[in-house]
């Protein structure tokens, strides 16, 4: 189920699956409800420890069953991923840290009124992920008021510095606030070039999509079909940057299908799930659990209400079934996409719907001038 | 809302309009989704206009203006007022509205938390209302959506503010000593909401006040945390199913 | 992916010294203590040496102490252990753990795959 | 020094039975609520990894079929079923009291 308390004064030991520099726990927590192995964190804010390197420190963690020891730690923040509750699965983050310096590569500066106006630009700007803003009081005369785009490998800032008279916040893309506008478009039979920033195995191209819009480093992708020549580069999709925003060359290519990350859509964004059953179909994966139930859909409820479940398979094997009650492969992978695609064979596989934003999930609850 | 600034697009998601079409069209009240099907407001809204036909409930919107003969709205299934509200009173001020259709939850059109039942421990700290009502007592209904930060009061002592009036538990009052930020007419039925443990709540819903924004005079909510039974029971019965966000 | 690689092992000695290092990579090393354990051919895992994530504080083993020294670069991702003095005794495989207690308790999650130092004449 | 004694040092077993490591030390390994006992397999001719931590938290990855028990003193590891994959040498490290120390080992073979 879904779980939103917070643990203050307490980390979690152990588990580790990742670890970054984070301004605060919701960010943290949002960090972790995204990642595909993550379900509970621990965050060390600036005021609770003595360490300089560990400040701001988020440490994202896995446990086979769900739960980890808690140490005490004054000051630490602790907590479980939202994986589960339904609409507050959400990548936009919306507040302004006063009083930080979040690093980066710094790629573009400009002379703006107010941090808002930062934020804003950091949102219009295809590569940026986050951003500093020296305010009108800020030491060095010659840096106020200036506004920093910033980007980093994972996204996240490189380092989260107190420094007065600064402040720092993420680009609202993940908010649908970006005025850029997105490539609905896919298309086939061509491949892009440029920078590969990850590689995973995908079913189609609309869910290899999906993982590029959430990303933090994808602007566009190159999927390759299940009929590709190469037969180890089957069902891999590639996702892209490149220095420009844009794929700076592309070519005709049978059986490959390209597009582009749509986080830069205004109003909508796809929900982080893929909800589709792909028939004859089998996701290879570590085995988290095998059930028998009645029916592919019962199979997807179920790996979605085990929370570390990522994909399922649903085998129609002779061998495989009792009576209308069929085995159910519940699995898990590091990347959270199969680790391999096999088709033709009897059954069904998918994703868990664990991360799709539409579930009901309980989460959280004589008159003068009436207004 | 006096004393407050604009919204940005998908600050407060829960956050409605209910708008009455009569010969023109105009907005009357706010109200905060709960659900995919369930609106939360005040019962005076309804005082004088009980028929579902006429209102139209626009969502995921922050501009009233925006707004065209073209923009989707909701409709409303049933009104649910509370049994124990009086048009005379101030008392039980609430009500659920069911909508004909489901909406679809986006970054724009999404539910707010309810409090745990009768919570009462919980302090908070960081509360904001919002609306598209007056920016001053003798105003007018403004465009873009308002929000405003307001901290709350005691029962206490918004009981010393209203001596005329009985502030029961089952409200929240909020406000300035000196006044300058507070609700006012046409934010009636909207959210007074507060973010604990990162987590927003609604935690008030609007209801009355002595004015707007004047000193020593709060403005008096409906404490939601006090109707969580009346609220599951209703949105339970009416299709069998929890519909809202109930907490964990 | 976490990474630990090891370097710096060989033949030495009595007496001689040694640098081992532990290049670190898929984590934010500066967020984690990390410590060297040792395993002498055919016995058993013997802690040897730790350090904070800031390199602030380190700890020793009795039978090091004074003789070996932790160190960290958290700019290069990389952990050191400077032997000096060495004895036979010290022959070992030496591996770099990295420790995600976040408490003075340790705990060593992930291991690099050892360097072998042989003290011998 | 705390001192970790396992039993038995070898432990022969048949593929599918259960087996059971025992782990004592010389003092109380509880503290602030937790137990910092940690078990650690290392197979032939690789390094060590993490198995169970904090008594009975099995790390990532690691079967359900490996269990961590125990309190004070007094310390088991349970496998349900022995499979091939599972020899190798058990080491049970606490890490309550400074320096944390391993015990000698238990090394799990088939019959």
């Known amino acids: 189920g879904c779980l939103t308390q917070l643990y203050e004064n307490a980390f979690f030991r152990g588990g580790d699956v990742a670890s970054m520099y984070t301004p605060n726990a919701q960010y943290c927590q949002m960090r972790c409800t995204f990642h595909p192995r993550c379900l509970l964190f621990s965050f060390l804010p600036a005021s609770s420890i003595n360490d300089m390197e560990k400040r701001f420190g988020c440490f994202l963690k896995d446990s086979v069953t769900g739960t980890l020891p808690k140490v005490h730690r004054t000051g630490a923040v602790s907590g479980h991923s939202l994986k589960q509750c339904g609409h507050q699965i959400s990548a936009c983050h919306r507040d302004i840290y006063k009083g930080v310096d979040m690093r980066g590569v710094n790629f573009n500066v400009s002379k703006v009124s107010s941090v808002e106006e930062c934020q804003k630009r950091c949102t219009s700007n295809i590569r940026c992920q986050f951003f500093s803003y020296a305010t009108q009081t800020f030491h060095k005369a010659e840096y106020r008021n200036n506004c920093l785009l910033k980007y980093s490998p994972g996204g996240t800032p490189t380092a989260i510095k107190v420094l007065s008279n600064v402040e720092s916040g993420f680009s609202l893309k993940p908010c649908a606030l970006s005025e850029i506008g997105c490539h609905m478009n896919i298309f086939q039979h061509l491949a892009f070039s440029d920078v590969d920033v990850a590689r995973v195995l995908t079913p189609d191209a609309f869910v290899c999509r999906t993982i590029c819009t959430y990303h933090p480093n994808c602007l566009f992708f190159t999927f390759y079909t299940n009929v590709w020549k190469i037969e180890s580069q089957r069902n891999v999709c590639l996702l892209k940057t490149s220095e420009s925003g844009t794929p700076s060359s592309s070519t005709p290519q049978e059986n490959t299908i390209s597009g582009y990350s749509l986080l830069t859509c205004k109003r909508t964004l796809p929900e982080p799930c893929h909800s589709k059953i792909y028939p004859g179909v089998d996701f290879g994966g570590e085995e988290l659990n095998v059930t028998f139930v009645k029916g592919v859909n019962v199979c997807q409820e179920t790996c979605t209400k085990m929370i570390r479940c990522q994909f399922f398979t649903y085998s129609l094997l002779p061998e495989d079934c009792k009576e209308e009650k069929c085995k159910c492969f519940l699995r898990l992978s590091m990347d959270g996409s199969p680790t391999r695609i096999a088709y033709g064979t009897q059954g069904s596989s998918g994703y868990s719907l664990r991360l799709c934003n539409t579930g009901d999930n309980s989460v959280c609850t004589t008159k003068t001038s009436t207004r | 809302i006096v004393g407050g600034t604009n919204s940005s697009w998908g600050e407060w998601p829960w956050q409605v309009s209910l708008q009455v079409k009569l010969t023109a069209q105009r907005h009357l009240c706010g109200g905060s989704l709960i659900g995919h099907q369930w609106v939360l407001t005040a019962a005076h809204c309804f005082d004088g206009l009980p028929l579902q036909d006429v209102w139209r409930i626009y969502s995921g919107i922050l501009n009233l203006s925006d707004i065209t003969k073209d923009t989707p709205f909701s409709q409303i299934k049933e009104i649910i007022i509370h049994q124990n509200y009086k048009v005379s009173e101030g008392n039980h001020d609430i009500a659920l509205i069911k909508l004909q259709a489901p909406l679809n939850y986006t970054e724009f059109q999404k539910p707010i938390c309810l409090p745990s039942k009768g919570d009462t421990s919980t302090i908070y700290t960081n509360c904001w209302v919002t609306g598209w009502g007056f920016s001053k007592e003798k105003g007018e209904i403004q465009n873009i959506l308002q929000k405003v930060n307001i901290p709350l009061v005691t029962n206490e002592e918004c009981q010393k503010r209203y001596q005329d009036y009985k502030i029961t538990q089952r409200m929240v009052c909020a406000g300035y000593k000196e006044g300058g930020k507070d609700a006012c007419k046409g934010d009636s039925g909207g959210p007074l909401v507060c973010k604990h443990n990162g987590m927003w709540r609604l935690v008030g819903i609007t209801s009355w006040g002595e004015g707007c924004a004047r000193r020593e005079q709060p403005g008096v909510y409906t404490k939601v945390a006090e109707y969580m039974d009346w609220i599951l029971e209703k949105t339970q019965s009416s299709d069998g199913k929890a519909q809202m966000q109930s907490p964990a | 992916e976490v990474q630990l690689l090891e370097s710096g092992g060989g033949l030495v000695q009595p007496g001689g010294s040694l640098r081992l290092s532990c290049a670190a990579s898929g984590f934010t090393f500066s967020f984690y203590a990390m410590h060297w354990v040792r395993q002498a051919p055919g016995k058993g895992l013997e802690w040897v040496s730790g350090i904070v994530p800031s390199g602030g504080r380190t700890h020793y083993a009795d039978s090091v102490k004074s003789r070996f020294t932790i160190s960290r670069d958290n700019s290069k991702n990389t952990l050191y252990l400077q032997m000096n003095s060495l004895r036979a005794e010290d022959t070992a495989v030496y591996y770099c753990?990295?420790?995600?207690?976040?408490?003075?308790?340790?705990?060593?999650?992930?291991w690099g795959q050892g360097t072998l130092v042989t003290v011998s004449s | 020094d705390i001192v970790m004694t396992q039993t038995p040092p070898s432990l022969p077993v048949n593929p599918g039975e259960p087996a059971s490591i025992s782990c004592r030390s010389s003092?109380?390994?509880?503290?602030?609520?937790?137990?910092?006992l940690d078990w650690y397999l290392q197979r032939p001719g690789q390094s060590p990894q993490l198995l169970i931590h904090t008594l009975s938290y099995r790390a990532s990855g690691v079967p359900d079929r490996f269990s961590g028990s125990g309190s004070g003193t007094d310390f088991t590891l349970k496998i349900s079923r022995v499979e091939a994959e599972d020899v190798g040498v058990y080491y049970c490290m606490q890490g309550t009291h400074w320096p944390p120390t391993f015990g000698q080992g238990t090394k799990v073979e088939i019959k």
């Open positions: 003092q109380s390994l509880s503290d602030d609520g937790n137990t910092y």
């Open positions: 753990a990295t420790d995600s207690s976040g408490s003075p308790n340790p705990l060593f999650d992930y």
